[in-house]
């Protein structure tokens, strides 16, 4: 019986470890600045790193600019988006800016997109200052189903800060769906 | 066999509880305003509370102004930094402020510091208003190794709001590294 | 013994699943804009959705405008609050605004309220721009006891953005108290 108990304990340790890891997908994606669209209108950001520097992904997929859920669950989603302008970059088209982020969810089954979180600010970036900066942070807890896709839309993409510590988004699974 | 099963169940409950608690380090550190450095340039904030009010720490260490990781894992890191100015608080030299936070990671093995997250804003705080306030929030999911250190750098430290609900940072472990 | 082991394994799977789910309360509450108070002073927001759109709750209770903790634990709390004004909404009483959020905890045993987190900004929303927007995000890790209540206070509630992706707050349990 002791041998059997040891076997039970052993298999349980394996099972616990395995199920724990399987149950916890995550991603932290950082902006790929080589392909940031221009303009001031709202655009979807499709170029993100998933495997360099701070960027990483596990049990989720990154494809076509979207973070794809592989496992049903409740996830904490977050995004940090930084905008900046230096006078050496040239004049702004307008001093009145709407700097916004939208974290959206798309279901393939029902091909529609819904905004989960939004944040931002209207800003007056006057020529009296040589440098302007603004960051947005949003986060929230959402039920995600396998196959659903998370994407990031921003206004004024040409003003994005391309640093990996500045512009990123991510998700981690917190618990299963009952 | 029933007794044996009960023993297995009991030991498993203990093991599960124990491993769960051991596997989840956390910290929530609040600003110690008695020792905020002066200057406008980027400075590292070294004085934080870890055991009063909302501040707490478990299975992590706070030493020399840095939050030290004791257990490998993936952690969610966050910081909330508030800046404020009242006309009675002191004299501003300029209306144009760069209010920033940088969450940095230092590895002792490779003595170098890297910024994990940054946020903030340039602000125009005019004398036409008697009170000014601004808060920054950043958060993200990062792989941390035992011995690595997390610290907070800010610009304009003398403008920091010293309340425990205003200026704080923290971390909690979400999962093991595979 | 094999049958017994299967029974152990089976009961353990049940126990693990059950205890895991029981151990992880959560809530994501979105603003109910049909009942937002007017004025510019700090008010407690009491109308939130808990069961429509992105709003959801499990193993916590929403009552009288407060999120009630049913299970001791360490929770990650967050809030995202958006303010907006369009010139078609009418004139602002003042161009100088203090747009703030306070996440508070009330203990029934000791009937007192304490602010866990605050964030926001003073803003100058001049008539030169037809639209103004600003979002605040706060988050932090707190020990909550059964019966304690979380509520949200804001300044300038009449400027709140009523969208479910804009103004919300939530919590999820991360770990037990030792």
């Amino acid at each position: 019986i002791r041998a059997e108990k040891a076997m039970v304990d052993g298999s349980w340790l394996d099972l616990a470890k395995r199920s724990k890891l399987e149950a916890q997908p995550f991603a932290h994606l950082t902006i790929n600045a080589t392909d940031i669209p221009s303009g001031s209108h709202k655009v979807s950001l499709s170029s993100w790193y998933h495997d360099r520097g701070w960027a990483k992904i596990s049990n989720m997929t990154f494809s076509n600019g979207k973070l794809i859920v592989n496992q049903d669950g409740f996830y904490y989603l977050y995004a940090n988006i930084c905008f900046r302008h230096h006078e050496t970059s040239g004049d702004l088209a307008t001093e009145y800016l709407q700097l916004m982020v939208y974290v959206t969810k798309t279901s393939i089954k029902i091909p529609s997109s819904h905004t989960l979180m939004k944040g931002g600010s209207t800003k007056y970036w006057s020529g009296n200052s040589e440098f302007h900066f603004y960051s947005i942070n949003v986060g929230g807890f959402f039920k995600l189903r396998s196959g659903e896709e998370i994407s990031i839309e921003v206004s004024n993409p040409s003003l994005l800060d391309p640093d990996q510590d500045a512009t990123y988004f991510g998700a981690f699974k917190v618990r299963d769906i009952d | 066999i029933r007794a044996e099963k009960a023993m297995v169940d009991g030991s498993w409950l203990d093991l599960a509880k124990r491993s769960k608690l051991e596997a989840q380090p956390f910290a929530h550190l609040t600003i110690n305003a008695t020792d905020i450095p002066s200057g406008s340039h980027k400075v590292s904030l070294s004085s934080w509370y870890h055991d009063r009010g909302w501040a707490k720490i478990s299975n992590m260490t706070f030493s020399n102004g840095k939050l030290i990781v004791n257990q490998d894992g993936f952690y969610y890191l966050y910081a909330n930094i508030c800046f404020r100015h009242h006309e009675t608080s002191g004299d501003l030299a300029t209306e144009y402020l760069q209010l920033m936070v940088y969450v940095t990671k230092t590895s002792i093995k490779i003595p170098s510091s890297h910024t994990l997250m940054k946020g903030g804003s340039t602000k125009y705080w005019s004398g036409n208003s008697e009170f000014h306030f601004y808060s920054i929030n950043v958060g993200g999911f990062f792989k941390l190794r035992s011995g690595e250190e997390i610290s907070i750098e800010v610009s304009n430290p003398s403008l920091l709001d010293p309340d425990q609900d205003a200026t704080y940072f923290g971390a909690f472990k979400v999962r093991d590294i595979d | 013994i094999r049958a017994e082991k299967a029974m152990v394994d089976g009961s353990w799977l049940d126990l693990a699943k059950r205890s895991k789910l029981e151990a992880q309360p959560f809530a994501h509450l979105t603003i109910n804009a049909t009942d937002i108070p007017s004025g510019s002073h700090k008010v407690s927001l009491s109308s939130w959705y808990h069961d429509r759109g992105w709003a959801k709750i499990s193993n916590m209770t929403f009552s009288n405008g407060k999120l009630i903790v049913n299970q001791d634990g360490f929770y990650y709390l967050y809030a995202n609050i958006c303010f907006r004004h369009h010139e078609t909404s009418g004139d602002l009483a003042t161009e100088y605004l203090q747009l703030m959020v306070y996440v508070t905890k009330t203990s029934i045993k000791i009937p007192s309220s304490h602010t866990l987190m605050k964030g926001g900004s003073t803003k100058y929303w001049s008539g030169n721009s037809e639209f103004h927007f600003y979002s605040i995000n706060v988050g932090g890790f707190f020990k909550l006891r059964s019966g304690e209540e979380i509520s949200i206070e804001v300044s300038n509630p009449s400027l709140l953005d009523p969208d479910q992706d804009a103004t919300y707050f939530g919590a999820f349990k991360v770990r037990d108290i030792d």
């Epitope: - | 905020i36 450095p37 300029t94 | -």
Partner: antibody
Framework: EVQLVESGGDLVKPGGSLKLSCAAS????????MSWVRQTPDKRLEWVAT????????YYPDSVKGRFTISRDNAKNTLYLQMSSLKSEDTAMYYC??????????????WGTGTTVTVSS | DIVMTQSHKFMSTSVGDRVSITCKAS??????VAWYQQKPGQSPKLLIY???YRYTGVPDRFTGSGSGTDFTFTISSVQAEDLAVYYC?????????FGGGTNLEIK
Amino acid sequence: EVQLVESGGDLVKPGGSLKLSCAASGFTFSRYGMSWVRQTPDKRLEWVATISSGGSYIYYPDSVKGRFTISRDNAKNTLYLQMSSLKSEDTAMYYCARLDGYNYRWYFDVWGTGTTVTVSS
Amino acid sequence: DIVMTQSHKFMSTSVGDRVSITCKASQDVSTAVAWYQQKPGQSPKLLIYSASYRYTGVPDRFTGSGSGTDFTFTISSVQAEDLAVYYCQQHYSSPRTFGGGTNLEIK
């Protein structure tokens, strides 16, 4: 090269007025707070007035409050100090100084060459 | 007002010596103390700010230390050109106040 050059110092009778100027060059004047600091004949240094980069914050010590007015013209890169109801204890070398430290903890990182004000009957 | 006291009005030293000038604040000023050098016939120059930060271009023989109420300015190896009056100043709060100065003489 960063330079501050003061002018306007003179001999003036008690109760009289005088306006000092400080011409700035070599840096973006409109982005810095500025101050006047004086050095008395016994070589003591005394802060006299401060104006923020945009001109909306102005500060004085009690010793000159109501008598001295600091101002600036960012378009001309010039700082001014209008002094009235002058007293003999206002006799000093007046320096214009640039501020560093974008908050309460500012100090004087660049000083001008100075201009002499003598208040005597 | 915060009073800054430099106890030595004069100090005499030789080239190559190490010399320390002290400054005491009448109340806690954290680390908000600056040190200035004024050579004969010249305007003051910033050497140290926030107690220990060397201003741009200042030689590393000049150092500052201290916090709270007691501050020290040190020249590790005095040079002939260091002949000057050295002033401390608190930049903690207004009104900004200076010490009376310490006149460093070279023997």
